[in-house]
Interface confidence: low
């Protein structure tokens, strides 16, 4: 058993056949010594008396809010949550496996630049009685500070018969060093509580591996005289790290016909312009990627040819 | 070339070669990004590699003030990785394919380190750790880790030379 926060405790249970469970001793936070009784949740049934209560926690029926009273007055509360290990594996029931980039990916994180700011998100089908708290650090043995905000509901989607809820959190490394080569990964830890179930999820990454630039901005076409060719130009996204002579991007320019089956013409360039042939009804798209490290491409920025 | 006393390197040549190194490092092991090598207990292997750290002066401001600190650190790393790529880890079984980019990568590391430091002038170089994996699978894992680490190192080096070529070239 360990303390999650004040008056909230997590009991780690092996969800095993005939497992004896965990013996837990609760102590009433009061100078009083006698006349103390204990109840669980909303029930008025007295579970025991005295300053301490010893219980055997085996299943969810044994978890909940234990309250000690004296003469009708509430003295203190202890909320017991269960963290269960089933068939040798800690349960991961609250969050949905996003399966990208690999199985058992519950948290996904992205950064728009090297400033030390990143966003993580996760999915669940649970709509009520759900709380999250997020902690992060750079490295684990001698952790350096990363400050995370509160997790918020960022999207709701309907998937077949189910509703899916996306939560996200923004974090910022306290003393980020954008130009350095990271040697210790960022660790992100999410505590999830659904009713009386506790679970924790972790992710470990280098900022360089989760970089995904915003799409190029101010995408423009300039027709070239007496030619089917156009000059496409664009700019670095505002959110990208500066100076651009140091934090450089590379770009992919694509000409795509109306039909998805039409052949795509692609050009790769380090410049912020390119000359391409603009076909009727086609569109021109440009995306960006870190020039020197193959992290994710940005989403496409697009303009129609006509 | 950098010369004793600390004049500028051939920024543009260094830029071209470091960008080529980035391309080679990724073609040597493109799928490495899909393996979470941190799960494989890499403390003893990649903790010893020279990293370009915050105080090494490789940021734009540090390069403007005095690029020598940063160039020395990059040189140190290039020699370190050049030795690793020429070691038993890469030359032993399982042998690399004949057209593997590792050979080119090895030669380019040496080329860039020589651009940074002419003969007869020696910066301190870091000792290469004695890594002698006993099993072929351990050697494979070590290769992945080294290439993964090299990708991060050469990315920073390439940024330094690109910025130097754009802003510090005479």
């Amino acid at each position: 058993i360990w303390e999650l926060k004040k008056d909230v405790y997590v009991v780690e249970l092996d969800w095993y056949p005939d497992a004896p469970g965990e013996m837990v001793v609760l102590t009433c936070d009061t100078p009083e010594e006698d006349g103390i009784t204990w109840t669980l949740d909303q029930s008025s049934e007295v579970l025991g008396s005295g300053k301490t209560l010893t219980i055997q926690v085996k299943e969810f029926g044994d978890a909940g809010q234990y309250t000690c009273h004296k003469g009708g007055e509430v003295l203190s509360h202890s909320l017991l949550l269960l963290h269960k290990k089933e068939d040798g594996i800690w349960s991961t029931d609250i969050l949905k496996d996003q399966k990208e980039p690999k199985n058992k990916t519950f948290l996904r994180c992205e950064a728009k630049n090297y400033s030390g700011r990143f966003t993580c998100w996760w999915l669940t089908t649970i709509s009520t009685d759900l709380t999250f708290s997020v902690k992060s650090s750079r490295g684990s043995s001698d952790p350096q500070g990363v400050t995370c905000g509160a997790a918020t509901l960022s999207a709701e989607r309907v998937r077949g018969d189910n509703k899916e809820y996306e939560y996200s959190v923004e974090c910022q490394e306290d003393s980020a060093c954008p130009a350095a080569e990271e040697s210790l990964p960022i660790e992100v830890m999410v505590d999830a509580v659904h009713k009386l179930k506790y679970e924790n999820y972790t992710s470990s990454f280098f900022i360089r591996d989760i970089i995904k630039p915003d799409p190029p901005k101010n995408l423009q076409l300039k027709p070239l005289k007496n030619s089917r060719q156009v000059e496409v130009s664009w700019e670095y996204p505002d959110t990208w790290s500066t100076p651009h002579s140091y934090f450089s991007l590379t770009f992919c320019v694509q000409v795509q016909g109306k039909s998805k089956r039409e052949k795509k013409d692609r050009v790769f360039t380090d410049k912020t312009s390119a000359t391409v042939i603009c076909r009727k009804n086609a569109s021109i798209s440009v995306r960006a990627q870190d020039r020197y490290y193959s992290s994710s491409w940005s989403e496409w920025a697009s303009v129609p040819c006509s | 070339r950098a010369v004793p006393g600390g004049s500028s390197p051939a920024w543009t040549q260094c830029q071209q070669l470091s960008q080529k190194l980035c391309t080679l490092a990724w073609s040597a092991h493109p799928l490495v990004g899909h393996m979470d090598l941190r799960e494989e207990g890499d403390e003893e292997t990649t903790n010893d590699v020279p990293h370009i750290q915050c105080g090494d002066g490789c940021d734009p401001q540090g390069l403007r003030d005095n690029s020598q600190f940063c160039l020395q650190r990059i040189h140190q790393g290039l020699i370190f990785y050049e030795k690793l790529l020429g070691s038993d880890i890469f030359t032993g079984e399982p042998s690399l394919l004949p057209d593997s980019p590792v050979g080119q990568l090895h030669a380019s590391l040496l080329g860039l380190s020589q651009l940074l430091q002419p003969e007869g002038h020696h910066w301190e170089t870091q000792q290469i750790p004695s890594l002698s994996p006993s099993q072929p699978w351990q050697r494979l894992l070590l290769r992945f880790k080294i290439l993964r680490s090299l990708q991060a190192f050469v990315a920073v080096a390439a940024r330094v030379f690109a910025h130097g070529a754009a802003t510090l070239s005479p």
Epitope: P17, D18, F60, D87, I89 | -
Partner: antibody, heavy 114, light 112 residues
Framework: EFQLVQSGAEVKKPGASVKVSCKAS????????MNWVRQAPGQRLEWMGV????????TYNQKFKGRVTITVDTSASTAYMELSSLRSEDTAVYYC???????WGQGTLVTVSS | DIVMTQTPLSLPVTPGEPASISCRSS???????????LNWFLQKPGQSPQLLIY???TRASGVPDRFSGSGSGTDLTLKISRVEAEDVGVYYC?????????FGSGTKLEIK
């Protein structure tokens, strides 16, 4: 008393699907994962997958590459295992087993034959 | 997948004599929490498997104390101190340290 009661034997043609049920009683159905295991004649036991009845989350043995689907009907305290694209080598006894494998159903023989 | 190799394939024993079955795992089943995630089962002819031992060495309820489990993270052993006629059947080890859970090939215990 804990009990897992499975549906009766089935004979299927190659290419068909089979759905085996497992009705639980004597405990709170949603509190415990349900595993499915099969045993071909004279072969070792083979784990197929597991479901958490409370959330409907599943983990499958990749060997069955999308052929197996485990579901539950919590109102009926029943777990189901459906195996599609049946082949002769799927002839086996199929078992459901509660968390920790302490309690097993009696088994359902599925015969695949043309 | 973790491969479980069980020996012997067949084990003829005289009643009252001890018996030992070995199971080797291709990967350690010992977790950071100090527990070893291995089960032992007995499958009697025509019956479903029954759990004998879980967490490598803990006897399931109702299992006689002549059955014991021991081992390291990869080399596991089931011992029967004095074999009785009712102990005949096929014994299986099973790892539940990681998905997919896998079983050994089985050891058939017969009375001489």
């Amino acid at each position: 008393e804990f009990q897992l009661v499975q549906s009766g034997a089935e004979v299927k043609k190659p290419g068909a699907s089979v759905k085996v049920s497992c009705k639980a009683s004597g405990y709170t159905f949603t509190d415990h994962n349900m595993n499915w295991v099969r045993q071909a004649p004279g072969q070792r036991l083979e784990w197929m997958g597991v479901i958490n009845p409370n959330y409907g989350t599943t983990t499958y043995n990749q060997k069955f590459k999308g052929r197996v689907t485990i579901t539950v009907d919590t109102s009926a305290s029943t777990a189901y295992m459906e195996l599609s694209s049946l082949r002769s080598e799927d002839t086996a006894v199929y078992y459901c087993a509660r968390r920790g494998f302490a309690y097993w159903g009696q088994g359902t023989l599925v015969t695949v034959s043309s | 997948d973790i491969v479980m190799t069980q020996t012997p394939l067949s084990l003829p024993v005289t009643p009252g004599e001890p018996a030992s079955i070995s199971c080797r795992s291709s990967k350690s089943l010992l977790y950071k929490d100090g527990k070893t995630y291995l089960n032992w089962f007995l499958q009697k002819p025509g019956q479903s498997p029954q759990l004998l031992i879980y967490l490598m060495s803990t006897r399931a309820s109702g299992v006689p104390d002549r059955f014991s489990g021991s081992g390291s993270g990869t080399d596991l052993t089931l011992k029967i101190s004095r074999v009785e006629a009712e102990d005949v059947g096929v014994y299986y080890c099973q790892q539940i340290a990681e998905y997919p859970f896998t079983f050994g090939s089985g050891t058939k215990l017969e009375i001489k």
